[in-house]
Every structure is written in C-alpha cells, then in structure tokens.
C-alpha cells in the first residue's frame, strides 16, 4: 500500500483545504524534473530559471554561462543545441507543432568564438529537422522533405536528396504513421559515431489513401487537411534506407542498404537503425504481419563503396504467441567488440529479459530472469550494464535501476535505487554521461519527484538537482487523496489496481466509483508515480473513489497477460474492468448505483464497450476521442494486434469489436462522447460513426466536439473539457454543485 503523507492532527485539518478544479487546470501542483544535457563524461548543460545556458563541470565544481538569456531572447529562442566541438550553438525559434513529435522551426547559428550570429549561407525556414554531427560542427537538416548537409554552419549547403515532395516523398523525416506508430521520433536520419556517414530513411507515400478533414480556422472557407494515413489493411508507405559518405557526398551518392530477403518477400516495415561503428550499422526490419523481426548487421565495403549485410549477420526474432516485442521491438545495445549486443526479448517462460547475443539468437545468453520484466537498457560500459526493471518487491508498476557487473564472472547484480528513498521513490529513470562516469536519477514518485546526481563508479549521490521544495510547501495545506496499489487474483489472472481514496475515507461508508481506463496493448496505468490531476481533485473535493485497473493486454507482467488480447481487441480488456468493478463492490464501500467509467483514446474505446456491455454496472461514462472501429485506425498499430481486416484473416473480429455494433446497449446508460474535429490520430470519423449509430438506434446521449482540436485537446479546450466532464459526473452521481 502506498499512502500519501497523512495529516492526523485536528488542529492542522482546520487549515487544510481540498483540491479545486482550478488548481488542476492552472497546473498549481505540477512538478519539475532535471535531465542534464550531457556534453562529456563530467560536463552538462542546463537552462537556468532565468534562461541562461549554463555549463556545469562536476569534477571542478565550476559552472559558467555559455549563452546568455539576452542572446536567447534576441531571436526568441525556445531551445538550443551545442555543437560537439563547442564552437557553435543552434538556437531554435518559431516553434510550430505538426504531429506528436514533429514540428518546424527557424534556426539561427551562434558562433561562440566571436559572440556573433553566423551571417551568410543562413539556414532556410522553416526547417523540419536539424542536428549536429556527433563530432565537429557539421549540420544535417531537412527542408521541404529533402536532406541537406553543411560542412560548417557558414558554408553553403550540399543537397543530398532531390525527390522530396509534400505528402508524397519524405527524406530524413517520417511520414505520419512511421512517426506515430514505429519510430516515435520527428527524425529519420542518423549520423555514424564520428560523423563520416549519414544514414536516412526515404518514405514513399504516393499510393497511400489520404485522410481529409476540415480545419475551420477564421476564414470564410475552411481549409482541408490532407494526410497520407494508412488505415488497417490499406496500402502502406514504401521505405528505403540510404547511407551517404558526408566527407565526399557527391562521389558515389547515397547508397541503399539492402533489405533481408525473408523480409523483402512481402510487405514490411523498417523499425530502427543503430550505428555500431563508423563502418558498421544495424538495421531492424519487421514483416507487415508483425510477428517476425529481423536484425541485420551491415558493413561498409570500401572497394565497392557499398553496404553489405551478410545473411550470417541476420538475427531473427519471432513470436508464436503474439506480436514481436512489447509495444515496439526492442533495440540492441552493442558491446565494445562492435558485434555482440544486449537486447530485451521474451525468455522461454514468456517474460521480457535481457539477453546477450554473440553469434546467433538461438545461442543467446540470458542475463536477467524471473517472473518480472527488464524494461530498458540504459547503458553498457566495459564493465557494467545499467537497466531498469519492475523486479523489486514484485510490484509491476515500479521501476528501479540496476547495475550488472559484466566485467566479472559470474556477473553480479546490484539495485542502485531500491533503498535510496524507499517511501518517496519507487519509479525511476536515469540519464548517463559519456562512459557512465556520472548519471542523473529522476524519481517520479510515488512521493514528490526528485532528481539527483550520482557517481557512475560508486553510485554515491553527489547532489540534488531538483527536489520540488516549492511544490512540497504548496501541498502542506492540501488534503490530498490517499492512494493504494494492490492486486486482485481472479481466475488465475492478477489484476493490479490503483485506488485513489478521498482524504477522510471511511470504509464503513459508501462512495461513488469512477473507473479511469486506458487498457491499450502494452500499456500500464497502475504505476507508482506522483500526480496531482483531475482524478486527484475528484477524490479530494468531490469524494469519489477512483480506480485504475491493469487487465489483460497490459505490459510488464509477462507474455501470458500481454498477448491474451492478440487478435481479440475489445474483449478481455473490457471483461477485466468489469471483473474489477465487481470485486470493488464486494469490498463494501462502493455505492453500486453510482459507478462510472471514463477513458481517452484506447480508453475511450474500452469505456464505450464497458458501458455497452449490458451488465448494468455502470450508471454513466465518458469517451474522449475514442476508437470506434479498428478499421478506422492506423495500419501499423492496429495490425500489430489484430492482423488484417480480410476474410481469410481477421475481418470477423474487426466487425464484431466495433462500438457501433453495440449501439442498442447504450440505452440504459448516460453516455458523454467527446472528440476534437482536427484529430489527426484517432479521426473524428470514429465518433461521427458512434453518434450516427446511436441516432439510428434512437438512443439518447450527450456529445461535445472541440473545433480544430487534435487528439490532445490542449489549451483552452482542456479547461472546457474537464469542467464539462466534472459537471457530467457530478450530475450522474447526484453531487451538488
């Protein structure tokens, strides 16, 4: 059980207040984290509160400003990047968001040696992506879907690609589906370790069907937004990977990296690229039916100036029980011999663990094992491997950082974080300097987040980087809800849940229950993290009990739970929420006439299906930006879990798992349906079809759209959304305004 610090003294309680919705909407109780921008083994940059860019040297204890806030302000810079030779800084301004990761910006180059902006051969605008080479101060950038190279910031550019075309050919940047569902980045180019080569992806979207929606804006006529967006079963982007020698880019030009034969025989994806050395690169490919992944190690052939990917350096990863990997196929972390690597994949017991691959995957040496999962490999040095897992005390929703000594035999394991601030900190991530000389730990909870700096050899804490003192003081007179993380055992399934309880919770009383659900494949909602958010307010002020349940399909508890939903989305996720609700009712403190469910995106889909389950458990519910049919969602995501919507594959379940098919069942619940009209991700089409089906079935429901808003419903829409949902729930639960 994780309890927030309790306040039991009566004298204190008089001065304490509940959270208000305004607190949440204003972000009054938001926290800060500190991630050093490492520039060497012992130095990092950080943007100070007054916007100076400061360089810190851990070993000398000295710090100095490398770029003043005045310089930043002169171009309205919101971001920066120091060149590895420390001669130049790019300043980023005019940020303009595109999709989840992508944005365009204007870039200025500041010369630190003379304290002036570089004049002549200035960068064009707006730029889609820009980065320094890992050594020196070469620049690669993407402008109008083409890649350019600059030897130095003041030099004219060298154009690498010429075929870039809006919505057709993307060079060095992903198209919509690769950005959102495969790469999870705004870029698709990768410098080799010393900057000799530049690898990049070319995405050809020429044959992809286009999603078109209106953007109303302020003009007389709305604009139409067109995005090549492959829905399930549709034509996919065609990807090619090229590598160019940046020292003499014109000589042989971009060289295409061959696709493994077993991948190229049918539709496929490129999933990631990892440089090993300047002349060795590792590419990962995935069949369209995403249960086979191939890792291919390629070498530069000087004589032919080409890249050779021998079959002996192809490593196949296959899943027989589900899809390959977790959410994504894991990426390799190469060791110092530049051929063997460490990688997370399922062991024979169906738990994701670190394996060491020296020659073949079949001969992989398992490094971690147990009924828990290794989650991320942070760094491999000559003698240590740092990773995170949820092993400690068997809580899947925790993250601790471990060090395995790979230099000694047998390797010894040490938990770096488990006992540091045990009550406050159970969910960590880490950021390492070069050669893991130092590292920062960022603790996300369950207590107030704290960021600390550590010695990479001894693990000794050197200093606190951010401890959120202001937040701690601000919370002193707030009646925060209590939180507990527990599990239910049902039919050989473990259902972990987080319950958020009103401050004066009394087990002998009855409380309205709100289920917050996401439930998507490989997601996790029950995490030991700190948050003061809308549901905290609902518990603190409105006296609701809120529960989050991780059912089948969720992550980090083994493949049995994860792959249970394979090819059957919309069944077990819903069943497990319902099962949990029944168990909560049995606990005796839930008013079974006042139970609601809400979710966003995949959670909107699950909440809709739960409301339409015909159980009579739910009085009301909310779906924000829900998927309503898997035929409407992106191919890469949907097909990973559902296969293809074809007769000879899985069309039947595609049809059976829609929200529309259950329209009649909404008759006995209060349903609030919400969607942004400019949602590029889960298209408004999804809610439009739910609404149409409900109207056709003559079922009453409530709805709210947000004009020109995307999947995030940001800005003023956020305030309106949460205010609207609060009113809806209070009305549903008969709570007075």
């Amino acid at each position: 059980i994780v309890l927030r610090p309790s306040r039991v003294h009566n004298s204190e309680e008089n001065t304490m207040r509940a959270l208000t919705l305004k607190d949440i909407l204003n972000g009054t109780f938001s926290y800060k984290t500190f991630f050093p921008n490492w520039i060497s083994g012992q130095e990092y940059l950080h943007q100070s509160a007054d916007n100076n860019i400061v360089l810190y040297n851990i070993e000398t204890g000295q710090s100095y400003t490398i770029l003043s806030n005045r310089t930043m302000k002169s171009v309205n810079a919101s971001n920066y990047g120091l060149s590895p030779d420390r001669q130049f800084v790019y300043l980023e301004s005019d940020y303009s968001k595109l999709w989840r990761y992508s944005y365009t910006a204007t870039y200025y180059i500041y010369d630190l040696s003379n304290g002036e902006f570089v004049r002549g051969n200035e960068l064009p605008r707006p730029i889609q992506y820009l980065c320094w080479s890992p050594v020196g101060s070469k620049l690669a950038y993407v402008y109008q879907n083409n890649i350019y190279l600059k030897q130095r910031p003041g030099d004219p550019p060298f154009q690498i690609t010429f075929n870039g075309r809006e919505n057709k050919i993307f060079n060095g940047i992903p198209d919509w589906v690769y950005e959102e569902e495969m790469l999870a980045t705004k870029y698709a180019l990768w410098w080799s370790p010393n900057g000799k080569f530049l690898a990049y992806a070319e995405f050809n979207d020429t044959d992809i069907p286009v999603i078109a929606y209106s953007y109303y804006g302020d003009e007389q006529y709305p604009r139409t937004i067109n995005i090549p967006y492959p829905k399930a079963g549709a034509k996919n982007p065609v990807v090619r990977i090229f590598i160019i020698d940046t020292t003499y880019p014109a000589y042989v030009g971009p060289q295409e990296v061959p696709v493994p034969a077993m991948i190229a025989s049918s539709d496929y994806y490129f999933s990631w690229l990892t440089w090993v050395t300047d002349e060795r690169v590792c590419l990962q490919w995935l069949k369209r039916v995403q249960n086979v992944s191939v890792l291919s190690i390629c070498d530069f052939r000087e004589d032919w100036q080409t890249w050779d990917c021998p079959k002996t350096q192809e490593h196949i990863e296959e899943s027989r029980t589900g899809w390959a990997g977790g959410f994504f196929v894991s990426t390799p972390v190469f060791s110092y011999d530049a051929i063997s690597y460490y990688k997370i994949f399922s062991d024979k017991d169906g738990y994701k663990h670190i394996h060491y691959i020296k020659d073949t995957v079949e001969n992989a040496i398992q490094i971690t094992s147990g009924k828990w999962e290794a989650i991320n490999i942070f760094r491999v040095t000559q003698d240590s491997l740092f990773y995170s897992s949820n092993e400690f005390e068997e809580y899947p929703g925790r993250r601790n950082i471990y060090r395995i000594s790979i230099g000694s035999y047998p390797p010894s394991k040490k938990c770096v974080t488990c006992h540091l601030r045990k009550e406050r900190c159970q969910y960590y991530t880490a950021s390492f300097s070069d050669y893991a000389k130092y590292y920062a730990l960022v603790c996300y909870g369950p207590g107030i987040p704290i960021s600390t700096l550590h010695d990479g050899r001894t693990d000794q804490e050197i200093k606190i980087l951010e401890e959120n003192k202001e937040l701690e003081n601000a919370l002193k007179n707030i009646q925060l809800p209590k939180e507990e993380i527990k599990k239910l055992e049902v039919d050989e399934i473990t259902l972990w849940y987080k319950m958020i309880l009103p401050p004066q919770f009394d087990r002998s009383k009855k409380y309205p229950l709100l289920i917050q659900v996401y439930g998507g494949p490989c997601s996790q909602s029950v995490r030991s993290v700190f948050a003061v958010n809308w549901i905290s307010y609902l518990a603190s002020k409105e006296g609701m009990v809120i529960a989050l349940v991780d059912g089948r399909g969720t992550a980090f508890q083994g493949d049995k739970l994860l792959y249970a939903v394979y090819r059957k989305l919309g069944v077990y996720e819903v069943e497990d929420q319902i099962t949990a609700v029944r168990k909560f009712i049995e606990m005796g403190f839930i008013d079974e006439k006042r139970i609601a469910i809400w979710g966003w995106s995949y959670g909107g889909y699950v909440s809709s299906l739960a409301l339409a389950s015909g159980t009579g458990l739910f009085k009301c519910g909310i779906a924000v930006a829900p998927v309503s049919s898997w035929e409407y969602y992106a191919s890469v995501y949907t097909e990973r879990f559902m296969g293809l919507p074809t007769k000879d594959d899985n069309l039947e379940h595609y049809k059976n798992s829609t929200v529309m098919a259950r329209a009649e069942y909404f008759r006995n619940v209060d349903y609030l349906l919400i969607h942004g009209t400019a949602d590029d991700n889960v298209h408004f089409q999804n809610s439009a079809q739910i609404a149409k089906a409900l109207v056709n079935a003559q079922v009453d429901f409530q709805a709210m759209w947000y004009s020109d808003q995307n999947h995030g419903l940001s800005g003023l829409s956020t305030n309106h959304l949460y205010t609207h949902m609060t009113h809806f729930l209070k009305q549903c639960f008969s709570l007075s305004d």
Partner: antibody, heavy 118, light 107 residues
C-alpha cells in the same frame, strides 16, 4: 575571413623538384578537402590533386601521378605539393583551393608560378 | 575521366545583353556542376555551385540551370565587370574536370 596563400614557386630545371606550400586561415582547415589546380600560360584550368580531411586519402590527375605528392599538416593549417621529376609541361600558375564537399572550389589562393625550363 | 565541353569558346556582347554559356558533360554528373569566373592575372572565383545555387556575394544576374549532362550559365544583363573567362567544372567524380573556358569579350 577565409584566406589561402601559396608559396614555393619559382624556376626549376626539367627533372628537378619543388615543394609548394599553402597557408590556410579563417576556417577549420582539418575539416575540408583541399586541392591544387594549375593553369598553364594562356590555357584553361587543370585539376592536379586533392587530399581529403580526416584520413588524408589522396587523388591525382594522370598527368602527375607518381611524380607529385599532396600532403597536409593540420596542426600548421598548411597544404603541400611535393613536385618531383618536373617537366616543361608542368609550367603553370599553381592554385591552392578549398574543395567544399569534395565537389566545388569555393576559395582559391592567388597562385604561385612554377616555371620548368633549362 | 568525364570530359566537359563548353560552347561557345568565345563570344562578343554588349553591356545589358543577355548572355548564355552552355556546358555538356560526357556522362551524367547529376547536379554536381559548378561555374567559375576568371579575370586576367587573377584566381578563379566561384559563381554557381550545384548547377543552380548562387554563391554568397555573387550578383543575382548570374544564374545556372540544368542537370544530368546539359547545363547553362546565364548572365541576364551583362555588366562591364562581367567581361572575363568562364569555366564549368564537374564535381561528380573524385577527379574534377573543367571545361576549356568561354571568353566573354566587349563587342
């Protein structure tokens, strides 16, 4: 400001040797391809030799291969051309030039005259 | 080696004239074609790189076009200081080669 200054030219007998130097300033010399280009009196431009940054790999025109050697000293920001077994047809103004991306000559020196005559 | 052929080898023109010089490569050089101006007793000066990009500081009356094997340098309105010899150069190979030059003289 980028500057390239050649030196070492002069009169030499056929079969003789000469070493040209090119002092570079105003840019990070080690990052760039560098070349020698020559121009015989009243004639057009002829590329002679190129040296790459980083690994200092070299290339030569067929007319000078085996006789001329290009080299660089990145610590001194200097480019060299060692010319052996000189012939009358090697008489020319020799220009040192920066070869951006190994593709175009964006900065040139003022040139140094080499005369091969008996 | 790639051979570069310029035409004409010389031309006479007046101030204000539009002048066009062509350059043909013996094999495809993509867009790796550059143009230089040289005045007597001086070093060559880069005008156009990558077929059509104007070098910083070069007047906009100079323009380049073409790709593959055929390229053009155009001076939209000839100025007195433009009387010089112009060279094309391919940079597609490790052995760059120059055209024989085009001398632009006063009519």
């Amino acid at each position: 400001e980028v500057q390239l200054v050649e030196s070492g030219g002069g009169l030499v007998q056929p079969g003789g040797s000469l070493r040209l130097s090119c002092a570079a300033s105003g840019f990070t010399f080690f990052s760039y391809w560098m070349s020698w280009v020559r121009q015989a009196p009243g004639k057009g431009l002829e590329w002679v030799s190129t040296i790459s940054p980083y690994d200092s790999s070299t290339a030569y025109a067929d007319s000078v291969k085996g006789r001329f050697t290009i080299s660089r000293d990145n610590s001194k920001n200097t480019l060299y051309l060692q010319m052996n077994s000189l012939r009358a047809e090697d008489t020319a103004v020799y220009y040192c030039a920066r070869l951006l991306y190994g593709t175009w000559f964006d900065y040139w020196g003022q040139g140094t005259l080499v005369t091969v005559s008996s | 080696d790639i051979q570069m052929t310029q035409s004409p080898s010389s031309l006479s023109a007046s101030v204000g004239d539009r002048v066009t010089i062509t350059c043909r490569a013996s094999q495809i050089v993509r867009t790796y074609l550059n143009w230089y101006q040289q005045k007597p007793g001086k070093a060559p000066k880069l005008l156009i790189y990558a077929a059509s990009s104007l070098q910083s500081g070069v007047p906009s009356r100079f323009s380049g076009s073409g790709s593959g094997t055929d390229f053009t340098l155009t001076i939209s309105s000839l100025q007195p200081e433009d009387f010089a010899t112009y060279y094309c150069q391919q940079g597609a190979q490790l052995q760059p080669t120059f055209g024989q030059g085009t001398k632009v003289e006063i009519k």
